[in-house]
Interface confidence: medium
Amino acid sequence: WLEENCDTAQQSQCPEGFDLPPVILFSMDGFRAEYLYTWDTLMPNINKLKTCGIHSKYMRAMYPTKTFPNHYTIVTGLYPESHGIIDNNMYDVNLNKNFSLSSKEQNNPAWWHGQPMWLTAMYQGLKAATYFWPGSEVAINGSFPSIYMPYNGSVPFEERISTLLKWLDLPKAERPRFYTMYFEEPDSSGHAGGPVSARVIKALQVVDHAFGMLMEGLKQRNLHNCVNIILLADHGMDQTYCNKMEYMTDYFPRINFFYMYEGPAPRIRAHNIPHDFFSFNSEEIVRNLSCRKPDQHFKPYLTPDLPKRLHYAKNVRIDKVHLFVDQQWLAVRSKSNTNCGGGNHGYNNEFRSMEAIFLAHGPSFKEKTEVEPFENIEVYNLMCDLLRIQPAPNNGTHGSLNHLLKVPFYEPSHAEEVSKFSVCGFANPLPTESLDCFCPHLQNSTQLEQVNQMLNLTQEEITATVKVNLPFGRPRVLQKNVDHCLLYHREYVSGFGKAMRMPMWSSYTVPQLGDTSPLPPTVPDCLRADVRVPPSESQKCSFYLADKNITHGFLYPPASNRTSDSQYDALITSNLVPMYEEFRKMWDYFHSVLLIKHATERNGVNVVSGPIFDYNYDGHFDAPDEITKHLANTDVPIPTHYFVVLTSCKNKSHTPENCPGWLDVLPFIIPHRPTNVESCPEGKPEALWVEERFTAHIARVRDVELLTGLDFYQDKVQPVSEILQLKTYLPTFETTI
């Protein structure tokens, strides 16, 4: 197989008895993406697969970048918070049991949620065989794979391969269509010697040889262009050092009252379980770990405050205190922990060292192609397409990997809008109620009528503002029973949520400005009732008098209008959103400084922003009753996050509103918190921390959609599968490995 040129078969070349291509899912634990480029000459077989088939620059693991969570994500398409295997070690207070890789408890089906690939295949009449895979020897939903092997790490790789080849030799009636194969390398060697070590190099040669044996065996059976094979890894690997350790004893006078899952993705919970599990003061722990040292190498979070892209909060097994650790550092209880040096993983899944490989080859896959990175939650839907079966509900976005396939099996379509919009009509230029709002500039009704009349756009003006400010179409509302209306302005368009008394979204386009100086300050002392929205559906300005901590923010920044006259279009109650004062500092800096920078760099950007309500931190928009629970004697609900989606043209010679091809996206989901303690901003100007904070909370457009119930880009003329690629793209700025 190795010696021959790449075969380019348009059809599958399957021998007699193989009506449809089998699928082999092959995992090489801890095979970080960089190995593939650095050591390609030492891995001729894998390198041939890369050359002849399709591969991504890397595949993103889910957080924490550990073995069991990611292997089970790959075969379910679910985030760890959803499938339940949130780490290699965990405690479940409801089961009152501990899960670890060294105990038989791991075979208790209660830990394993979701539907793994082997069950999806079996439920639809196919057989499945697993030569090791986390979960494969567990009676998930009462069933095992058709064929499975009890885990035994000492079985030589060659023996594993020859067994799988024997399974392919089974009679048609007994033969599986789906196979898994698992190798512990190069992970074991990476832990022992670190990622840049002779041991890893040796391990890469060993796994390459075994992989070559599989391909050769397929070739001998004339299956090498019949089988669809996916070669991937669960995560990467990074070097650790014994002088890069954070000890909890440096932060607490005593540590015996809590238990800590130590290492690159630490969690802290009560020591005395189950008794103290729920009463444990997680907030106090996070307070005591926040901004304690100028060179602190971890950030403490309550899990609901973690970046939303991680989807690591909504599970009782995820302890409330989480430490987000710097690259190559470890956080442990005390100096008695000497488990350092060598390699480790578990870190932030944006770190380049945590990137995993993805390669694929076979009749269904495109050839000689490199694709952009994607997340491992997408692989389950892809495998279902390869097997031509229906996936179980999962966190992947079906169709987002269609570009890997010669002929896509599933054709996605845009979601149907669930709640239809109305237009908030302009009836009277004078408000029926002032809503306790104040605008000394407008001292008489003539002046007030004049500025309100500016809100009464003609059809031509509406068409013009939509073209510029909604270049990809208005966001569609996928939530049920949401009474909302569109508000048109010359400089922005917003979708106003009547029940929430605030805009659900606001969309505007910031052109590339010759002048990159910050925007002028907003007219400081002017707000008025929006005459298009009934007072019963509007916020009162006086709402903000009650709580010293909450102030008003503008969703569309009035200062974006460079003349004070057009600022009046934004100084209205329908543009108000509640913000913590400290949050607003960051929000204002982003809009007055960073947004201008982005627009300049990208030949203009379209901005869509809005509030998010995720009080139950499940990564999905809250039902109205969930929000009502948190109203706390006010008419206006306080968002848990705010989103900002920046969209520009990939080809920078075009502006967003005239973009013929691919778009570039930069979405943010910023937790709305009363303090900026996450950034330790004391004594630091905004320039030193706001951009870093926004970058820490980058997300996918898909994450924004799930949290808002909105659907974006429906009017962009482009195949839906390409739009889904855009929506599942996560911008990253990590440069160092």
């Epitope: 306790d436 709002c437 300050p521 400081p524 707000l527 300005c541 006086s542 903000y544 102030t551």
Partner: antibody, heavy 123, light 107 residues
């Protein structure tokens, strides 16, 4: 905490210009969120609002004095000033500077006051 | 301009007694009304902002109520140190105006 201190001549001749300065200490005038106001009180009488300024320079004046009054701000010195032209004996008063907190554009009460400075208009 | 009318102009009260001062606006001012206390030869001090919110450090015996055109300042149990002139002030529309003042004297 924030303190205000008025300064300026205690005696001004009729037809001349009354000039007072209010120095802000313990906080920055340009941090936003506040108006800075001048108020006067004629002997034995009530309070009369003269005008306000925002750090950006926007001003609002009492129409009864508008043609004669100018309020300005110097953020570098953390000061704001009052000028009242063409004074007469009727302008004799205690002049106060004060800070006004703004919440959602709604001006609040005057929460910090200077101790006041007496200005007599007499030849 | 908005005219604020306070009543009474003068009140003589014994200690521990409840004092009520009203302020009526010539047109609706929402809750943009504030109350001040001024003792002889001193600057005014803010007591109540936005009609009913106590300013920090002000004794709890002082309270405010009302909205629109009718407002009340209440001193629940008068103390000797409360002898002063009390002013209401509107910041709803320019020009800002003050009431004429109510002088409270201890009997």
């Amino acid at each position: 905490q924030v303190q205000l201190q008025e300064s300026g001549p205690g005696l001004v001749k009729p037809s001349q210009t009354l000039s007072l300065t209010c120095t802000v200490s313990g906080g920055s005038i340009s941090s936003g969120g506040y108006y800075w106001s001048w108020i006067r009180q004629h002997p034995g009488k009530g309070l009369e609002w003269i005008g306000i300024i925002y750090y950006s320079g926007s001003t609002y004046y009492n129409p009864s004095l508008k043609s004669r009054v100018t309020i300005s701000v110097d953020t570098s010195k953390n000061q704001f000033s009052l000028k009242l032209n063409s004074v007469t004996a009727a302008d004799t008063a205690v002049f106060y500077c004060a800070r006004v907190a703004i919440v959602t554009t709604i001006p609040g009460g005057m929460d910090v006051w200077g101790q006041g400075t007496t200005v007599t208009v007499s030849s | 301009e908005i005219v604020l009318t306070q009543s009474p102009d003068f009140q003589s009260v014994t200690p521990k007694e409840k004092v009520t001062i009203t302020c009526r606006a010539s047109q609706s001012i929402g809750i943009s009304l504030h109350w001040y206390q001024q003792k002889p030869d001193q600057s005014p001090k803010l007591l109540i902002k936005y009609a009913s919110q106590s300013f920090s450090g002000v004794p709890s015996r002082f309270s405010g109520s009302g909205s629109g055109t009718d407002f009340t300042l209440t001193i629940n149990s008068l103390e000797a140190e409360d002898a002063a002139t009390y002013y209401c002030h509107q910041s709803r529309s320019f020009p800002w105006t003050f009431g004429q003042g109510t002088k409270v004297e201890i009997k």
